[in-house]
């Protein structure tokens, strides 16, 4: 038997993936555990194998279909269970009635690119990945720029309160190396959270023009 506190958290990427993390304070040596997904009205179910991510937590991804297929909607409820093998039997360790569109976490934005760069400004664009058509334009973004000598944690957050897949960074220093990241969040969902940050995009501003002798 397993004692201790259990925490079971899952997010839906809005298309065909539910990612889950299960943490359990009690020791679970060499035990095989799975997450089982049973939708309330769909003719499919899915299972994934929980793999250790730390001493007391395990994670897995329920792959529901091809990456851009819309496998669940706001009408669905999915019963998610953590099942662990005990000898020849399976024991239920955790259960939740999961409302996918109340628990959203999108994929990180992709395809970041510099559209135009000058001495003091840089225009950057990106794309969202595997985001449901149900959101239409109801998305927001956060962005941050890493300046020389600073950390990501120190970078001020810029908020875009609409579906805008570009930004014009101003007041940059000429001939300086920067990095840029962006993340996305749907407006829908009580427990919805920000996507992971995108892969950083490195860029360099143009050098200032040399002054002419008079």
């Amino acid at each position: 038997a397993v004692n201790g506190t259990s925490r079971f958290t899952c997010f839906y990427n809005s298309r065909a993936n539910i990612s889950c993390v299960w943490s359990q304070d009690g020791a679970l040596q060499d035990t095989s555990c799975q997450v089982h997904a049973w939708p309330d009205r769909r003719r499919w179910n899915q299972t994934c194998e929980l793999l250790p991510v730390s001493q007391a937590s395990w994670a897995c991804n329920l792959i529901l279909g091809t990456p851009d297929s819309q496998k669940l909607t706001a009408v669905d409820i999915v019963t998610l269970r953590v099942m662990c093998r005990e000898g020849v039997r399976w024991r239920m360790m955790a259960i939740q009635d999961f409302k996918p569109f109340e628990n959203l976490r999108l994929m990180a934005p992709i395809s970041l690119q510099v559209v135009h760069v000058e001495t003091h400004r840089c225009n950057i664009s990106w794309k969202i990945s595997q985001a449901s058509h149900y959101f239409e334009r109801h998305l927001e973004f956060e962005a941050r720029t890493l300046s020389p000598g600073h950390t990501w944690e120190e970078a001020p957050l810029m908020t875009l309160k609409q579906k805008q897949e570009w930004i014009c960074l101003e007041t940059l220093t000429p001939d300086t190396q920067y990095e840029f990241q962006v993340r996305v969040k749907p407006l829908q969902g009580e427990f919805t959270t920000w996507s992971p940050w995108s892969q950083p995009l490195a860029f360099r501003t143009k050098p200032a023009a040399l002054g002419k002798d008079t």
Epitope: D40, R41, R42, R43, S69, Q70, T73, A74, V75, H133, Y134
Partner: antibody, heavy 116, light 107 residues
């Protein structure tokens, strides 16, 4: 095999209420949403609402909000749909149907006639 | 509400014909579309769910396709028992809605 058996035809006066029953068998009653759909004479299908017998969760078509009540009795695997303040345009065949994939199994229908 | 517009509203065909009925959703509904067959005085019968999946027991001459807003039900070779009314249905978002129906008659 899965079966949904509905109560018999009803004739009601305007302003009255009608309660239609739907008895399910052949599957785990608590697990699947039961839908109510109606069809006026010579017309198409209209969704009224749904109930999940296990939890009692309900979703209505706003068109019927305040007039339709859906309940269930898990001991007899029966769901009920009550429609109040009846008017002549509520004359229709009322169907219960299970939602699994789509609306996969249907009751035989209950004819409700509203006439003064 | 999502409108489901079916066409044609009626259709005359002969046994052995290939018949196509289309349904257009007023908004993107992914693949959450079903097709039903109804004969006079009877309850609808489920044919297709998730736009293209046939229920067990449904003959292979019935097929569904489409995603987003445009959907099709095809009967590859009409049989005498196929003359009926056909409805499309979206269950992507509340309230669930149906097409107005296509009446398939013998020519």
């Amino acid at each position: 095999q899965v079966q949904l058996v509905q109560s018999g035809a009803e004739v009601k006066k305007p302003g009255a209420s009608v309660k239609v029953s739907c008895k399910a068998s052949g599957y785990t009653f608590s697990r699947y949403w039961i839908q109510w759909v109606r069809q006026a004479p010579g017309q198409g299908l209209e969704w009224m609402g749904e109930i999940l017998p296990g939890s009692g969760s309900i979703n209505h078509n706003e068109k019927f909000q305040g007039r339709v009540t859906m309940t269930r009795d898990t001991s007899t695997s029966t769901v009920y749909m009550e429609l109040s303040s009846l008017r002549s345009e509520d004359t229709a065949v009322y169907y219960c149907t299970r939602h699994y994939g789509s609306f996969d199994y249907w009751g035989q229908g209950t004819t409700v006639t509203v006439s003064s | 509400d999502i409108q489901m517009t079916q066409s044609p509203s009626s259709l005359s065909a002969s046994v052995g014909d290939r018949v196509t009925i289309t349904c257009k959703a007023s908004q993107n509904v992914g693949t959450d579309v079903a097709w039903y067959q109804q004969k006079p005085g009877k309850a609808p019968k489920s044919l297709i769910y998730s736009a293209s999946y046939r229920y067990s027991g449904v003959p292979s001459r019935f097929s569904g396709s489409g995603s987003g807003t445009d959907f099709t039900l095809t009967i590859s070779s009409l049989q005498p028992e196929d003359f009926a009314t056909y409805f499309c249905h979206q269950y992507s978002s509340y309230p669930f809605t149906f097409g107005q129906g296509t009446k398939l008659e013998i020519k």
